[in-house]
């Protein structure tokens, strides 16, 4: 039961995270005009990964896409790439994890296949979350650098003659959405990886290792296995535990390969 819950929760958390990554990528408020210490203007500027917008006090909003590809800063291109890779990996991870869910029966899919799929989707979610966090962090770093560069006494303009106080930009809502979403996707991925360990079926476990004792032979087995004395029926690599039906919690208690040295 705990495995199903962990896997299900991991899936839901990742789903929310990826939805957030998509939302953040599409949002226009990656950077917003810094209003602190600025002359009060009747226009508010904000920028996204794909376009920049201006909202006038009158309520009229005008957005212009970045129609050039080569003219854009390399950092912006890198952030775009990271976010898209994050979305693609996350989407594939979601697709894989749907089939990996323990509560969903697909033909005669073995538990080992589900475990592998769960692990794969978990890794994909982790990488997806890291991509989003990296993308947002790179953009935030870019903003911080530009913020301190564009001080109030710096002027820009056509031919250097137009006195335009350079607009300073600060963190927009999309950055926070991206960080939270990336974190959720990462957490969801970790949960999927944890669930994978519990999903690993009995067939994948190592067999009991026999040790020759000085007196009579005893097959040593870690907790969870039935002890068996002598080699009689157990010398032909047969399973020594009962192969009958078990609850998910019982399956979890079986040793993994890491229990053996």
């Amino acid at each position: 039961m705990a495995v199903t819950a962990c896997q299900g929760l991991g899936f839901v958390v990742s789903l929310i995270g990826i939805a957030g990554i998509i939302a953040a990528t599409c949002m226009d408020q990656w950077s917003t005009q810094d209003l602190y210490n600025n002359p009060v203007t009747a226009v508010f500027n904000y920028q996204g990964l794909w376009r920049s917008c201006v909202r006038e006090s009158s309520g009229f909003t005008e957005c212009r896409g970045y129609f050039t590809l080569l003219g854009l800063p390399a950092m912006l291109q890198a952030v775009r790439a990271l976010m898209i890779v994050g979305i693609v990996l996350g989407a594939i991870g979601l697709l894989v994890s749907i089939f990996a869910l323990k509560c969903i029966r697909i033909g005669s899919m073995e538990d080992s296949a589900k475990a592998n799929m769960t692990l794969t989707s978990g890794i994909m979610f982790i990488v997806s979350g890291l991509c989003a966090i990296a993308g947002v962090s790179v953009f935030a770093n870019m903003l911080v650098t530009n913020f301190w560069m564009s001080t109030a006494n710096m002027y820009t303009g056509m031919g250097g003659m137009v006195q335009t106080v350079q607009t300073r930009y600060t963190f927009g809502a999309a950055l926070f959405v991206g960080w939270v979403a990336g974190g959720l996707t990462l957490i969801g991925g970790v949960m999927m990886c944890i669930a994978c360990r519990g999903l690993a079926p009995e067939e994948t476990n190592y067999k009991a290792v026999s040790y020759h004792a000085s007196g009579h032979s005893v097959a040593y087995k870690p907790g969870g296995f039935k002890a068996s004395t002598g080699f009689g029926s157990n010398t032909k690599n047969k399973k020594i535990y009962d192969g009958g039906a078990r609850t998910e919690d019982e399956v979890q208690s079986y040793p993994s390969k890491h229990d053996y040295v």
Epitope: Q33, P39, V40, T41, A42, V43, N45, Y46, Q47, S52, C53, V54, E56, S57, S58, G59, F60, E62, R64, T156, G157, V162, Q163, T164, V165, Q166, T167
Partner: antibody, heavy 117, light 113 residues
Framework: QVQLKESGPGLVAPSQSLSITCTVS????????VSWVRQPPGKGLEWLGV???????NYQSALRSRLSIRKDTSKSQVFLKLNSVHTDGTATYYC???????????WGQGISVIVSS | DIVMTQSPSSLTVTARERVSMTCKSS????????????LTWYQQKPGQPPKLLIY???TRESGVPDRFTGSGSGTDFTLTISSVQAEDLAIYFC?????????FGSGTKLEIK
């Protein structure tokens, strides 16, 4: 079509309050801002203040302490109140709808107000 | 507050003549976000309320004849009437619509000979 009409007293005594109502039609006060402008006889235009669609207001620096603009969206009315008016308050008061570029694209006919005892 | 300076204060021209008037602001009205200048021109005929002619320094309001052209950027702006008509007799005001408060220029009075 868009229409704005100012109404209020034509005569106000000095040190009293001047209140003018602007009734609008053809647009919603939720979506658009309304500015107030006055023009003393034979002089230029003086911007007084604005109330935006979201209810935010901005005022002329010199009048900020004495001026207030509010609105009743349901009645499509905007109210201007100028406290303790002086004789220099004698002017034609206009209300105007604010559009693109924060420009005033539709104006009322104006109301002439005389400040005199 | 932003100071808007208009010149000349009055102009006397003959019909069909080309005329220009200028407006200078004490600070730039250029917004880098949308590459627009927040400068507006109004026309006020005698006994009438002002009428919007041009916004964003060069965008003509619908219904305004194309003989009216706005130009300029940053702090210096010009309103040009390519061929003055008798009905253009009016006072022309420029206004800052970028910084609060939205200050007006003192106006340029256009008279026809």
């Amino acid at each position: 079509q868009v229409q704005l009409k100012e109404s209020g007293p034509g005569l106000v005594a000095p040190s009293q309050s001047l209140s003018i109502t602007c009734t609008v039609s053809g647009f919603s006060l939720i979506n658009y801002g309304v500015s107030w402008v006055r023009q003393p006889p034979g002089k230029g235009l003086e911007w007084l203040g604005v109330i935006w669609g979201d209810g935010n207001t901005n005022y002329q620096s010199a009048l900020r302490s004495r001026l207030s603009i509010r609105k009743d969206t349901s009645k499509s009315q905007v109210f201007l109140k100028l406290n303790s008016v002086h004789t220099d308050g004698t002017a034609t008061y206009y209300c105007a709808k604010v559009g693109r570029g924060n420009a005033m694209d539709h104006w009322g006919q104006g109301i002439s107000v005389i400040v005199s005892s | 507050d932003i100071v808007m300076t208009q010149s000349p204060s009055s102009l006397t021209v003959t019909a069909r003549e080309r005329v220009s008037m200028t407006c200078k602001s004490s600070q730039s009205l250029f917004n880098s976000g949308n590459q627009r200048n927040y400068l507006t021109w109004y026309q006020q005929k005698p006994g009438q309320p002002p009428k919007l002619l041009i916004y964003w320094s060069s965008t003509r309001e619908s219904g305004v004849p194309d003989r009216f052209t706005g130009s300029g950027s940053g702090t210096d702006f010009t309103l040009t009437i390519s061929s003055v008509q008798a009905e253009d007799l009016a006072i022309y005001f420029c206004q800052n619509n970028y910084y609060y408060p939205f200050t007006f220029g003192s106006g340029t009075k256009l008279e026809i000979k």
